[in-house]
């Protein structure tokens, strides 16, 4: 199945790579503008330079373009916890991350939220912090994972998934309860 | 205790409106960072929209971004999302919840409002 081409790349691809179609003369090819540029003005004919304008501060275009604005820089989210890796120049957006000792948790394709890695106290690291992925504990015995924390077997209610790695000190508490009622 | 109450929720047909307000007690909602998310029928949950605490920076999902506003009345503790242009697919019951700290999970729920957009 050949994928379905809008509009303007159905106009782009009759241009060789590089150019694209005058939007008001099809028989004319006007190179596209640099990365860090918009175009200002199509090219007025065959041979002649298209009139490319650069970005203006907090905006910018990150490949060969025919649009006519350049796109603004995306600002981190103080709010999510994010940090600005690298500002935003002319020809590359704004690079967003986490601070040192945390990762990204996106909540979605294009937002991410900035946690701090677990330590993994009460347990060993099974898996080490990532860019994007938490840190894997393993719990000592008598501890169990909640929330990516090994937790005391003393807090786990019989109703929760913890009742299977905690069942011998579950079963301790209940024989204390039992031996303490005759 | 830390409660939030979702309301305005109903039957409403394609391209109409409605507003959901969020109440909220129990913790300094001015300094809290609130989310709206979603869940579909059958579906999991979608990030709607966020706020920050001052109500300054907003974040919205692709799929409703230009139709949706959230907002904040901090001297009421209520959290707003106004829903226009509605559309079938935003059919879902929506929830308020604290921005999550200090993992990715909720740590307080309403008990959600179903929006139903229906002809």
């Known amino acids: 199945l050949v994928p379905h081409l809008g509009d303007r790349e159905k106009r782009d691809s009759v241009c060789p790579q590089g150019k694209y179609i005058h939007p008001q003369n099809n028989s004319i090819c006007c190179t596209k503008c640099h990365k860090g540029t918009y175009l200002y003005n199509d090219c007025p004919g065959p041979g002649q330079d298209t009139d490319c304008r650069e970005c203006e501060s907090g905006s910018f275009t990150a490949s060969e373009n025919h649009l006519r604005h350049c796109l603004s820089c995306s600002k981190c989210r103080k709010e999510m916890g994010q940090v600005e890796i690298s500002s935003c120049t002319v020809d590359r957006d704004t690079v967003c991350g986490c601070r040192k000792n945390q990762y990204r948790h996106y909540w979605s394709e294009n937002l991410f939220q900035c946690f701090n890695c677990s330590l993994c106290l009460n347990g060993t690291v099974h898996l080490s912090c990532q860019e994007k992925q938490n840190t894997v504990c393993t719990c000592h015995a008598g501890f169990f994972l909640r929330e990516n924390e090994c937790v005391s077997c003393s807090n786990c209610k019989k109703s929760l998934e913890c009742t299977k790695l905690c069942l011998p000190q579950i079963e301790n508490v209940k024989g204390t309860e039992d031996s303490g009622t005759t | 205790e830390v409660q939030l109450l979702e309301s305005g929720g109903g039957l409403v047909q394609p391209g109409g409106s409605l507003r959901l307000s969020c109440a909220a007690s129990?913790?300094?909602?001015?300094?809290?960072?609130m989310v709206w998310v979603r869940q579909a029928p059958g579906k999991g949950l979608e990030w709607v929209s966020h706020i920050d605490g001052g109500g300054e920076s907003t974040y919205y999902a692709d799929s409703v971004k230009g139709r949706f506003t959230i907002s904040r009345d901090n001297s009421k503790n209520t959290l707003y999302l106004q829903m226009n242009s509605l559309r079938a697919e935003d059919t879902a019951v929506y929830y308020c919840a604290r921005l999550p700290p200090p993992g990715p999970w909720f740590d307080y729920w309403g008990q959600g409002t179903l929006v139903t957009v229906s002809s």
């Open positions: 129990g913790f300094t909602f001015a300094h809290e960072a």
